[in-house]
């Protein structure tokens, strides 16, 4: 906290500007106006403050706005967001993309700090749900962001979301993730024709059931292994070694590459030797 | 439930063979999504994963102990067996039998059971 | 064979503490990550299996996250009964490894 003391004569701020930085601390504290600073915040951030100066900006607006900052205010941060604790962010009720916008863009680059995860979380919460634009938004940001949300917050995705998901956004989802995702993207995807309908749910096949797996083994989808691998172990262990077949078309002959790792290691151990034989690929079950 | 009981010498001389059976109560050792494993603790060490066995006989060996492990199932007497040859004294530990649901991990072990190799 | 690497080996924390133990695989395991709860002088219990399921009857303190080489596994508010030793273990490669524990003291 800075100690309350008179603004020398002459001192008083009248605009934000470059001026600023070369008063002291204490000079800050007594000469600028915190309603002044709360109007002008988007010249804050073409000023190049240090940050003992930043904290004291931001001290200021603590304490105009104790109950939390307008948007007004928060969309013109800047720089000064890296200053906010999740303490003071949950205070805050953000409503526009922009500004949501406006402040990632200030941690670009970085991996999402506690800061901003408490800032999406207050902003989705805020919309009651994950619509696309904000999804767009997000997994633009940080392409791992869907696969950091637990499965109850997954839930809360609408399925015409899903078309904002990019096959990259699901890199690092484990099972129980793709579990609610999967049913989201066959429900958004169900219009589509067969061949473009594979390229959409391929990403999102590690949710599938063993169901829907027999029915994409009848339609030439020709699976690559590294989503096969990805597949749950539950869904594959009842596949006949026809439908991996046709499920793979000429990728089957991947499986020998994999058939220390699984789910492959799992199926074959599951399958009769004269079955896996047909493969011509020396598979041991 | 299913319970997992091991049997066998808790002492053999350095050079002979170790053998321990594993008896599985309260399930069957036919079980789809089960297969069968030993895995051993030396005292005061970490666990060392020795091997898995399916009903079906197909068998899965830690590449490490692989020339001197055999693991074997007898389905009419809902058990399966380790025979680790050529024993030293490294091979004192605790020994496991434990079953891998596929779906999940090893969700049930037997108490284990002190093996010394000592002349 | 795939190394698993745990850390720290040995912690000491409170009751009510949060801690945090992570697993790293030499290449990725994908989901294929299980955690153990070893206490002296008894078997192994499973934790977590695939990353992240917790076992049935295990407390939901616990928790599992990471796919790929990287895993950690959570107890959010520690108790009495979770002093003991925590194994991670892949079963993605058919020649199953453990990571070699965390020991979990009392402070």
């Known amino acids: 906290e800075v100690e309350k003391t008179a603004c020398p004569s002459g001192k008083k701020a009248r605009e934000i500007d470059e001026s600023l930085i070369f008063y002291k601390k204490w000079e800050l504290e007594a000469c600028v106006d915190a309603a002044l600073l709360a109007t002008q915040m988007d010249r804050v951030n073409a000023i190049p403050f240090t940050y003992e100066q930043l904290d004291v900006l931001k001290h200021k607006l603590d304490e105009l706005y104790p109950q939390g900052y307008p948007e007004s205010v928060i969309q013109h941060l800047g720089y000064l967001f890296l200053k906010m604790s999740p303490e003071d962010i949950r205070k805050w009720n953000v409503t526009s993309l922009e500004t949501l916008k406006a402040l990632l863009e200030v941690n670009k680059g970085h991996e999402m700090s506690p800061q901003v995860a408490t800032l999406i979380d207050r902003f989705v919460k805020g919309r009651g749900q994950l619509d696309k634009d904000t999804l767009d938004t997000l997994t633009a940001f940080y392409p791992g962001y869907l696969c950091s949300l637990s499965p109850e917050e997954l839930s809360s995705v609408p399925p015409s979301s899903i078309w904002a998901v990019r096959p990259q956004d699901l890199d690092t989802c484990d099972p129980r993730q793709l579990d609610v995702l999967y049913p989201k993207a066959r429900l958004a995807f169900q219009n589509m024709n067969g061949s473009e309908y594979f390229v959409k749910i391929q990403s999102f096949l590690g949710g599938a059931p063993t169901e829907d797996l027999k029915a994409l083994s009848q339609q030439n989808v020709s699976m690559d292994l590294a989503t096969f691998m990805k597949l749950r172990t539950d869904a594959v262990l009842p596949l006949t070694v026809a439908e991996v077949q046709k499920l793979l078309g000429p990728h089957v002959e991947g499986l020998k590459a994999e058939e220390r790792h699984r789910p492959v290691r799992d199926w074959i151990l599951r399958q009769r030797q004269d079955d896996l034989d047909t493969l011509g690929l020396g598979l041991q079950g | 439930q299913v319970q997992l009981q091991e049997s066998g010498p808790g002492l053999v001389k350095p050079s002979e063979t170790l053998s321990l059976t594993c008896t599985v109560s309260g399930g069957s050792v036919s079980s789809y999504y089960s297969t069968w494993s030993w895995i051993r603790q030396p005292p005061g060490k970490g666990l060392e994963w020795i091997g898995y066995?399916?009903?079906?006989?197909?068998?899965n060996y830690n590449p490490s102990l692989k020339s001197r492990v055999t693991i074997s199932v007898d389905t009419s007497k809902n058990q399966f067996s380790l025979k680790l040859s050529s024993v030293t004294a490294a091979d004192t530990a605790v020994y496991y039998c434990?079953?891998?649901?596929?779906?999940?991990?090893?969700?049930?072990w037997g108490q284990g059971t002190m093996v010394t190799v000592s002349s | 064979d795939i190394q698993m690497t745990q850390s720290p080996s040995s912690l000491s924390a409170s009751v009510g503490d949060r801690v945090t133990i992570t697993c790293r695989a030499s290449q990725s395991i994908s989901s294929y990550l299980n955690w153990y709860q070893q206490k002296p002088g008894k078997a192994p219990k499973l934790l977590i299996y695939?990353?992240?399921s917790l076992q049935s009857g295990v407390p939901s303190r616990f928790s599992g996250s990471g796919s790929g080489t990287d895993f950690t596994l959570t107890i959010s508010s520690l108790q009495p009964e979770d002093f003991a030793t925590y194994y991670c273990?892949?079963?993605?490669?058919?020649?199953?490894?453990f990571g070699g524990g965390t020991k979990v003291e009392i402070k």
């Open positions: 066995i399916y009903y079906s006989g197909s068998t």
């Open positions: 695939a990353a992240s």
């Open positions: 273990q892949q079963s993605y490669d058919a020649s199953y490894t």
């Open positions: 434990a079953r891998e649901d596929a779906l999940t991990g090893f969700d049930i």
